[in-house]
Amino acid sequence: EVEKTACPSGKKAREIDESLIFYKKWELEACVDAALLATQMDRVNAIPFTYEQLDVLKHKLDELYPQGYPESVIQHLGYLFLKMSPEDIRKWNVTSLETLKALLEVNKGHEMSPQVATLIDRFVKGRGQLDKDTLDTLTAFYPGYLCSLSPEELSSVPPSSIWAVRPQDLDTCDPRQLDVLYPKARLAFQNMNGSEYFVKIQSFLGGAPTEDLKALSQQNVSMDLATFMKLRTDAVLPLTVAEVQKLLGPHVEGLKAEERHRPVRDWILRQRQDDLDTLGLGLQGGIPNGYLVLDLSMQEALS
């Protein structure tokens, strides 16, 4: 913290300009009016201040706005944003997408910092939901953003926002997250025709139930193996050999390379070996011919 000292004669700052880089910390504290700084924040970024000098400028703004900065100041913080703590940011009320973009730009190319995470949280909570424009912006800066949200947080994503999601945005999502996103995607893309629908829904299929996979198998979609391997095991198990063959189309040959991995391994164990043999891929591990398969879950449901 800088001691309060009188500003030397002739050094009172009349505007925020490069002459201030020659001021010592105590001179900045004494000679720069906080209100002047607040109205000329946009100039700070064009001046190569030291970290120490920026600390003084931040301190002046903190004194001027103890309850949190107004958005007019926040929008022009630029690199001074990196000096803010999550506690500082929690005091803000950021409503403009332009402000959010300006601050995300400052952190561009870096991992999501605690400051950025807090800023996004404040912004989204202020809006009440993750609308399409916000999601567009966030995933542009942080492709993994969507998968960093909890299933509860994802539930506030409206189906209309799903149009902004790119396949790479879902790369790190786990099944619980896809369980939430898939029904939204299904709703968002429901009016598209078969092949277009599959292209859009493909990245979300890790959350699809068995009945939807069965329906897709009737549409000549030719699902690739990478997508198939990301499907929920419990959704794949009830599929018949014929359904999987139709679902994968020419990609069915890839099952051989994946026969030791889930969900293929578990699916093989549920199929009759006779049926697997019809694929001509040499898949082994199915139920031997003549064995009776009891579905115990069905039996329990009946009793």
């Epitope: 490069e18 970024n45 064009a46 001046i47 190569p48 201040f49 030291t50 970290y51 920026l54 690199y79």
Partner: nanobody, 111 residues
Framework: LQLVESGGGLVQPGGSLRLSCAAS????????IGWFRQAPGKEREGVSY????????NYADSVKGRFTISRDNAKNTVYLQMNSLKPEDTAVYYC??????GGQGTLVTVS
Amino acid sequence: LQLVESGGGLVQPGGSLRLSCAASGFTLDYYAIGWFRQAPGKEREGVSYISSSGGSTNYADSVKGRFTISRDNAKNTVYLQMNSLKPEDTAVYYCAADWPPGGQGTLVTVS
């Protein structure tokens, strides 16, 4: 975004040195550049400033008339020509582009 300072060394009082500030991984054209220095046990202080176009320069009172800042955008480098050096100019010199800090700095010893 990295800045690398060079050109420091040991020089006698009254001697000259030319420091360079080179940009690595980005183009300097768009940035205002400041030279700073920090003597042992003292606060870092501004020495000189040049605007992105090179049209505006500024100096600390203690170096006016002795130091000259310039830039060569084609070489992605900013220079600080230091003449008539004094023992009190001894410090680590850093450059910074709009957003600090610069690199590791370069040591200038006048003795």
